[in-house]
Interface confidence: low
């Protein structure tokens, strides 16, 4: 009897559409009204413990009151019907939960896939969030047979894997039904032969074989997936060098039908390549397999494709009739060496005279030569053969170099140091660029590189440091020997100087002082010194700043006050900022020389 409620709310378990209107009715029982001496006028409606304004109530009769909600926006509303009893005490009569949501939208983009060896899986776009438990059912049938429904699981509501085995070459019709408390909708039907939805297993046992005859090819072999007995396959074959991150692809038209081997051409000699392969139905209907496991192979060696960069240096302290010449060359990069380098062959021919041969393992050769003109050649050898020869004329001792490059410039760009010049009118065979770090503490140790005779702009290919002064020399090389070298200084990146200039007085008068300073050592400059600023002040006065050109090493301060202590310091500036030197003090005399009180 105690558990018998005082009334009830209708409807009992409402599910309503978001942003719709909804009316609930609370009906009081006669015995309750008699016991508490109340009627429907005493009903108070509450949502989530907040009282609803009376304007939303309608008294239907003495036992029933209704409340209406317009444009419901909450997903979950606790609604209670209460009565005000003796002394305005509130008693709960009944409570319900109003659940809001949306009817399902028509599922779209239904598509299916048959992973080889597995059952068909379909997926779709379920549409907007309904905020309600919505069940998706995948339905499928042949013209003559209905298959069991596939009910999507709650954690993957937009896909389902069927229970039956796939039959190829028979069309199947598939659609999706979506249903919740607010409605039921069906997707468009799709009709297809499952053979057009196959995703094959990847080819396996991929292996790579090289060829001794051709250094530019590698042969791939693989085992096809079992599905090859059902469909004709086509392939994507991708490859990259071992250290690369991006893949190249064989033209698809070359691999457009079932096969189990392929020869990849136009590869670089003596290079390790990584391959992978995938397949799908040859007409492009269906899905690509995953990529196979990768396999690698190395192409066979070929003779070096280029002669090394070749240059020479002459020891300036030569003895009478002879000079010491150091021939130098650069190691070929792997893509030009095309194999393991065995040795270098140098020939030296005195002008119209005998020839000397040298076989060298290093990248330099020092020889004593007479003061005559010589022709030097250099070839590099690997297992397969020799490169073409690099040829260098070492002119006679009395040779006068002319025809330098013009308008030589050097500048940093994109973290590299670029050099450009105007080419001489004469035919240049090649250019030699040499560079070194200028320092007061260490000799200028030179690095070098060679550029073709057609080049007039390049960057220095070395490990360059920031805030170091590089002396760069460009020498054009002609058929009869080197031209005149041209040099320029440059920085990869400037910084403010590490130290400022130390200023001192050269001469101090009653109303002026001649200041002097030394140029900053190159090791502390960290850039091109563009200008100096002299700052000077008295103990009580404002500081005055004077800008001075960077070519100067002295400056006269004028209009000074006699018998006064001055403080002076100096800053040097590069393109990246300045640095102050130490402060220096001096006092102007009370009288000029020869002047008496």
């Amino acid at each position: 009897e105690l558990l018998d409620p005082c009334g009830y709310i209708s409807p009992e378990s409402p599910v309503v559409q978001l942003h719709s209107n909804f009316t609930a009715v609370c009906v009081l029982k006669e015995k309750c009204m008699d016991y508490f001496h109340v009627n429907a006028n005493y009903i108070v409606w509450k949502t989530n413990h907040f009282t609803i304004p009376k304007e939303q109530y309608t008294i239907i009769n003495r036992t029933a009151s209704s409340v209406t909600f317009t444009d419901i926006a909450s997903l979950n509303i606790q609604l209670t019907c209460n009565i005000l009893t003796f002394g305005q005490l509130e008693q709960n009569v009944y409570g319900i939960t109003i659940i809001s949501g949306l009817p399902p939208e028509k599922p779209k983009n239904l598509s299916c896939i048959v992973n080889e060896g597995k059952k068909m899986r379909c997926e779709w776009d379920g549409g907007r969030e309904t905020h309600l438990e919505t069940n998706f059912t995948l339905k499928s049938e042949w013209a003559t047979h209905k298959f069991a429904d596939c009910k999507a699981k709650r954690d993957t509501p937009t896909s389902c894997t069927v229970d039956y085995s796939t039959v190829y070459f028979v069309n199947i019709e598939v659609w999706v039904e979506a249903e919740n408390a607010l409605g039921k909708v069906t997707s468009d039907h799709i009709n297809f032969d499952p053979v057009y939805k196959v995703k094959p297993n990847p080819p396996h046992n991929l292996s790579v074989i090289n060829s001794e005859e051709l250094s530019s090819i590698l042969k791939l072999t693989w085992t096809n997936p079992s599905i090859k007995s059902v469909i004709i396959l086509k392939y994507n074959i991708q490859y990259r060098t071992k250290d690369a991150s991006t893949w190249s692809q064989i033209p698809p038209e070359d691999t457009a039908s079932t096969r189990s081997s392929f020869t990849v051409q136009d590869l670089k000699p003596f290079t390790e390549y990584v391959f992978r392969i995938r397949c799908m139905k040859e007409d492009g209907k269906g899905y690509w397999s995953d990529w196979s496991e990768e396999a690698s192979g190395i192409t066979y060696e070929d003779r070096p494709s280029k002669a090394p960069s070749f240059w020479y240096k002459i020891d300036p302290s030569h003895t009478q009739g002879y000079r010491t010449v150091q021939l130098v060359w650069k190691t070929l990069p792997p893509f030009e060496a095309n194999g393991k380098i065995l040795d270098y062959e140098v020939t030296l021919t005195r002008w119209k005279s005998h020839l000397q041969n040298y076989t060298v393992n290093a990248t330099k050769l020092t020889v004593n030569l007479t003061n005559d003109r010589y022709l030097a050649t250099l070839t590099v050898r690997n297992l397969v053969g020799k490169s073409d020869a690099a040829v260098l004329t070492i002119p006679a001792c009395d040779f006068q170099a002319t025809h330098p490059v013009m308008d030589l410039k050097a500048f940093p760009k994109d973290n590299m140091l670029w050099v450009e010049w105007t080419t001489p009118r004469e035919s240049v065979k090649k250019y030699i660029l040499e560079w070194c770090v200028l320092s007061d503490k260490a000799p200028c140790i030179t690095d070098w590189q060679q550029e073709d005779g057609t080049v007039h702009r390049t960057y220095l290919r070395g490990n360059l440091a920031e805030s170091k002064c590089y002396l760069i020399t460009v020498t054009p090389v002609y058929a009869d020997g080197p031209g005149s070298p041209e040099s320029i200084k440059a920085y990869l990146k400037q910084a403010p100087p590490s130290k400022g200039p130390t200023v001192r007085t050269k001469k101090v008068g009653k109303n002026e002082a001649v200041l002097e300073w030394d140029q900053l050592p190159v090791d502390v400059q960290n850039g091109f010194i563009r200008n100096y600023t002299i700052f000077y002040r008295t103990i009580i006065g404002n500081e005055t700043a004077v800008n001075v050109d960077s070519s100067h090493t002295e400056y006269t301060l004028s209009s000074l006050t006699s018998d006064t202590l001055y403080m002076v310091r100096m800053a040097a500036y590069t393109d990246e900022g300045g640095k102050d030197g130490p402060e220096f003090t001096f006092t102007t005399p009370k009288f000029a020389q020869g002047e008496i009180e």
Epitope: C112, T246, Y287, W288, W291
Partner: nanobody, 123 residues
């Protein structure tokens, strides 16, 4: 096979931040999506966040508002910026190429997992 490489994990106090990276050399994040998952000791692996081909993002309720997923197409890298970390965020974080919809599967080497990077948040 795509080699996914996570990094950026470590130990941090509650309230701190970490930025995880997932790099896939040779894998184009512009043609596939990426998911982040995590697994705390003795618990099941759970979804954390995802980013799709077009840059659409999604988050588990437990990390919404604290974690941000983004990608750098040029570097083939997906990032997970984790702010206001809590002890319950502790776990092994792994990235996985995103299956996406069937329509994009043929563009994706999908379903590959990385080795994971450990995140430890102490109170």
């Amino acid at each position: 096979q795509v080699q996914l490489q996570e990094s950026g994990g470590g130990s941090v106090q509650a309230g701190g931040s970490l930025r995880l990276s997932c790099t896939a050399p040779g894998f184009t994040s512009n043609s596939c999506g990426m998911d982040w998952y995590r697994q705390a000791p003795g618990k099941e692996r759970e979804f954390v966040s995802s980013i799709s081909t077009d840059g659409t993002t999604g988050y588990a309720d437990s990390v919404k508002g604290r974690f941000t997923i983004s990608k750098d197409k040029a570097k083939d890298t997906v990032y997970l910026q984790m702010n206001s970390l809590k002890p319950e965020d502790t776990g092994m974080y792994s990235c996985k190429t995103k299956d996406g919809t069937i329509a994009t599967m043929e563009l994706c080497d999908f379903g590959y997992w990385g080795q994971g990077t450990q995140v430890t948040v102490s109170s």
